[in-house]
Interface confidence: low
């Protein structure tokens, strides 16, 4: 009587996540009477995939028809394969039995699952950093399989070199994760730039995956303040300027301070756009020189994204003043300066 | 759009030949196994012949030996070849797409009607 | 061949009411039972997979139930286009085999 054999052909399967695997296996003979059992693993902690005699396995279904009795086909068919579905799989004959007595085990398929990469998200700063500083951008993708991946990163449409990749676990897993790091050296030119995290995997046929992050969302432009009195008016009134220029975001507050004391405060609201994404805003003060029996030192006041105010302040000289003026006069631009009108 | 067109029916005398044809459209035929079901006129539904995503190929037992089931991926198209037709035979074939997780039907062409008669 | 056999062959209902047609198996199916329902001059229409899972755009007043060899379908609250003839499925193993059919009539 010749010996009853088990023959799984392919070695190796490999399916892409969400279609069918095939799982062939043949028996060389029905005798001796006994079930044909499907396991993941082999040894004493295997799990049962299918079992023709009993049992319900709605993933699983037989290729040919176990209930026909010359059927020697036990291949199965498992339908939406995910990457958890990875190892060798077994075909084993069992002898009829009280309890069924394992026979004979066919040499093991492994199932291999090319899983795509999740879609790349990309996570800035929590932080806005102004211009000339390095801030860091993460990316993340999970759940590809096989292990290879390839990352690169952009900056609007220039591939960046500062960065560092890591694909999760080092050893064999069913899935992995990819995360990484690129510092990016910000400019006040870039709330218009974006960064971009480009993931290949060969389940994307060529086609890579993309994660972007606006740079708007990781840089601050702080203002340039510039203070120019217009010429003294007939009405004994001077018509102050506020110009404050380049700013980013748009949130911003302005207060004017006389002698210390608050004249009026304002927000930014609604502001046109400059084409580099930046911001101006103007805010003008009258002062009436008449109503003053002493110097006006007015103080430009501007607190930008929550960061420390920053002051432009100058003196109007009351005593002498002549109706007409000259040219426009304007406040150096730093900090706390002063100047003083006449 | 998912949709099974049937094609190919019509009046064929005993011991002709007849070949069906089943255009899908919206999914991959070749993805899903692909089923033939016949409903003779007044009767109950029939299944008459599959085929598995990796080629395999069912039949019922009044078929075997006579029909053959085929697919060609680059047409997206199922096609059932009839040949030693009955009487029998004479009823509405449908189209059937199995689904994705365990062959259940899900989808079904509008039918075409094959007459076996002299 | 597993053998699936319907009860009744034919059944009268009003509108709003609710309904039970019963499948029996000749053998356990475990749960890979279909329902379908079929009007007149038309193709079946998929209702129910493995028992008691509905197809996409199925309404719920449909419910299945049912393992082994014993099964159910379920309409709660008749409307007039459910009047239909409704046919089980067993699809296990090759041959697919279906029930012969119950004819649902208006009172």
């Known amino acids: 009587e010749e010996e009853l054999q088990v023959i799984q052909p392919e070695k190796s399967v490999s399916v892409a996540a969400g279609d069918s695997a095939t799982l062939n296996c043949t028996v060389s003979s029905l005798i001796p009477v006994g079930p044909i059992q499907w396991f993941r693993g082999a040894g004493p902690g295997r799990e049962l995939i299918y079992n023709l005699k009993e049992g319900h396995f709605p993933r699983v279904t037989p290729v040919s028809d176990p209930t026909k009795r010359n059927n020697m086909d036990f291949s199965i068919r498992i339908s939406n394969i995910t990457p958890a579905d990875a190892g060798t799989y077994y075909c084993v004959k069992f002898r009829k039995g009280s309890p069924d007595v394992e026979l004979k085990s066919g040499a093991g398929t492994e199932l291999s699952v090319r899983a795509k990469p999740s879609a790349p998200v990309v996570s800035g700063p929590a932080v806005r950093a102004t211009a000339e500083h390095t801030v860091s951008f993460t990316c993340e993708s999970h759940g590809f399989s096989p292990r290879d991946i390839t990352l690169k990163w952009f900056k609007n449409g220039n591939e960046l070199s500062d960065f560092q990749t890591n694909v999760d676990p080092a050893g064999k897993s069913v899935s992995y994760s990819i995360r990484s790091t690129a510092r990016v050296v910000l400019t006040r030119r870039d709330v218009h730039s974006q960064v971009i995290c480009e993931v290949a995997h060969v389940t994307l046929q060529g086609d890579p995956l993309r994660g972007t992050a606006n740079l708007s969302e990781a840089i601050r432009v702080p203002p340039f303040l510039e203070v120019t009195q217009q010429s003294m008016r007939a009405d004994n009134q001077v018509n102050v300027t506020c110009q404050v220029t380049k700013f980013y975001p748009q949130r911003l507050q302005l207060t004017w301070l006389e002698n210390g004391n608050v004249s009026r405060t304002e927000m930014a609201s609604a502001l046109p756009e400059n084409k580099d994404g930046t911001y101006n805003w103007t805010s003008w003060l009258l002062v009436n020189v008449s109503a003053h029996r002493d110097d006006v030192k007015l103080t430009c006041q501007v607190e930008h994204d929550g960061q420390p105010a920053v002051n432009k302040s100058f003196s109007v000289k009351v005593s002498a003043h002549p109706k007409e003026q000259g040219s426009n006069t304007a406040a150096e631009n730093t900090g706390t300066n002063e100047r003083n009108i006449y | 759009e998912v949709q099974l067109v049937e094609s190919g029916g019509g009046l064929v005398q005993p011991g002709g030949s007849l070949r069906l044809s089943c255009a899908a459209s919206?999914?991959?035929?070749?993805?899903?196994?692909m089923h033939w079901v016949r409903q003779a006129t007044g009767k109950g539904l029939e299944w008459v012949s599959a085929?598995?995503?990796?080629?395999?190929?069912y039949y019922t037992g009044s078929v075997k030996g006579r029909f053959t089931i085929s697919r060609e991926n680059a047409k997206n198209s199922l096609y059932l070849q009839m040949n030693s037709l009955r009487a029998a035979d004479t009823a509405v074939y449908y189209c059937?797409?199995?689904?994705?997780?365990?062959?259940?039907?899900?989808?079904w062409g509008q039918g075409t009607m094959v007459t076996v008669s002299s | 061949d597993i053998q699936m056999t319907q009860s009744p062959s034919s059944l009268s209902a009003s509108v709003g009411d609710r309904v039970t047609i019963t499948c029996r198996a000749s053998?356990?199916?475990?749960?890979?039972l279909a329902w379908f329902q079929q009007k007149p001059g038309k193709a079946p229409k998929s209702l129910i997979y493995?028992?008691?899972s509905l197809h996409s755009g199925v309404p719920s007043k449909f419910s299945g139930s049912g393992s082994g060899t014993d099964f159910t379908l379920t309409i709660s609250s008749l409307q007039p286009e459910d009047f239909a003839t409704y046919y089980c499925q067993q699809y296990v193993s090759y041959p697919y085999t279906f029930g012969q059919g119950t004819k649902l009539e208006i009172k």
């Open positions: 493995t028992a008691s």
């Open positions: 919206g999914f991959t035929l070749s993805s899903y196994d």
């Open positions: 085929i598995g995503t990796a080629g395999d190929t």
């Open positions: 059937v797409r199995g689904g994705v997780w365990d062959d259940a039907f899900d989808i």
């Open positions: 053998q356990d199916i475990n749960n890979y």
